[in-house]
């Protein structure tokens, strides 16, 4: 019979025949030949192969070098990589989680929307008009202004994006 | 190797503004942020800020908040650090440094003059 | 801000005599999360800053070890056992808790 050209998925071509790729966390040992299938060898400890394939080599495991902020969020398998993400307070640079940038905090006058985690950033809002923040944090919303009325009290000193309203007592002198 | 490699010196009239590049190369670029320090004649270290390149996402000192610009070009591997209304203040040396173990790598520095 | 605050600002050594650098911050550098973001950078004259300490102890890559880093969370110390003639310069702390990051005022290490 004619040599093959082209193999069906999960296998690869090699000295004109088909032979199977290793599965997920195993790596190739030899082709598979006229008369044998072909040997693979799971991946060792800390290694990892994620495809079908024709490696001779697994990947090692991403190290989660903890002198640059990084913890394991998940352990790697013979099958997948680990997953490295930030300590508290940080969060990963970028998707590769290589590094990691220490978290923002929203300046007086600016409140978080939505705060930070471990892949992404403090996400800061101006204050509106009626809302205030005299701190800078990474966690603290825009606060209301007092409500002066309801406490029977009236507005002495407006209020501002980064200051309260301060509220006195009403005048009892009216003419 | 990592390398940053900046722009040459520059001398600028007050009011105007200054761009200073540093170009990153031995490292993946966006897996770390960028940041801008200067240091005045005979002074010590001040932050200006850094960028994050993957995100394209700044965060600069309030003291130079609505002066100061910094981007990045991921295709060139390149910071890049604007700063405008110059005044005799800013004559300074401008370093960028990558935040890695701490500030691990850091650019020959780029002397920025200001005077009429 | 957080202020940082070096003593001495000028440091004359004999060379094979210890000497101390002194660092404090208006705040204590210690995160809930357990470290302490305190760094240490040495600027030899005409050269670029280089790190010699991160998280307050850790020793950077090829630096000697008669370098030592050691502190609480506001009061920080750099020892050097033995001075040699290439470690003199500007030796700054930096806090890295929070924006802005702040430096100390340096302190200019010579040789008598």
């Known amino acids: 019979p004619e040599p093959p050209t082209a193999c069906r998925e999960k296998q690869y071509l090699i000295n004109s025949q088909c032979c199977s790729l290793c599965q997920p966390g195993q790596k190739l040992v030899s082709d598979c030949t006229e008369f044998t299938e072909t040997e693979c060898l799971p991946c060792g400890e800390s290694e990892f192969l994620d495809t079908w394939n024709r490696e001779t080599h697994c990947h090692q495991h991403k190290y989660c070098d903890p002198n640059l902020g990084l913890r394991v969020q998940q352990k790697g398998t013979s099958e997948t990589d680990t997953i490295c993400t930030c300590e508290e307070g940080w969060h990963c640079t970028s998707e590769a989680c290589e590094s990691c940038v220490l978290h923002r905090s929203c300046s007086p006058g600016f409140g978080v929307k939505q705060i930070a985690t471990g892949v992404s950033d403090t996400i800061c809002e101006p204050c509106p008009v009626g809302f205030f923040s005299n701190v800078s944090s990474a966690f603290e919303k825009c606060h209301p202004w007092t409500s002066c009325e309801t406490k029977d009290l009236v507005v002495q000193q407006a209020g501002t994006n980064k200051t309260d309203v301060v509220c006195g007592p009403q005048d009892r002198l009216r003419a | 190797e990592v390398q940053l490699v900046q722009s040459g010196a520059e001398v600028k009239k007050p009011g105007s503004s200054v761009k200073v590049s540093c170009k990153a190369s031995?490292?993946?670029?966006?897996?770390?942020?960028m940041h801008w320090v200067r240091q005045a004649p005979g002074q010590g270290l001040e932050w200006m800020g850094y960028i994050n390149p993957s995100s394209d996402y700044p965060n600069y000192n309030q003291k130079f908040k609505d002066r100061v610009t910094i981007t990045a070009d991921k295709s060139t591997s390149t910071a890049y650090m604007e700063l405008s209304s110059l005044r005799s203040e800013d004559t300074a040396v401008y370093y960028c440094?990558?935040?890695?173990?701490?500030?691990?790598?850091w650019g020959q520095g780029t002397t920025v003059t200001v005077s009429s | 801000d957080i202020v940082m605050t070096q003593s001495p600002l000028s440091l004359p050594v004999t060379p094979g005599e210890p000497a101390s650098i002194s660092c404090r911050s208006s705040k204590s550098l210690l995160h809930s999360n357990g470290n302490t973001y305190l760094y240490w950078f040495l600027q030899k004259p005409g050269q670029s800053p280089q790190y010699l300490i991160y998280?307050?102890?850790t020793l950077a890559s090829g630096v000697p070890d008669r370098f030592s880093g050691s502190g609480s969370g506001t009061d920080f110390t750099l020892k050097i056992s033995r001075v040699e003639a290439e470690d003199v310069g500007v030796y700054y702390c930096m806090q890295h808790l929070e924006y802005p990051l702040t430096f100390g005022q340096g302190t200019k290490l010579e040789i008598k």
């Open positions: 440094a990558r935040w890695g173990y701490s500030f691990d790598y």
């Open positions: 031995g490292y993946t670029f966006t897996s770390y942020t």
């Open positions: 998280r307050m102890s």
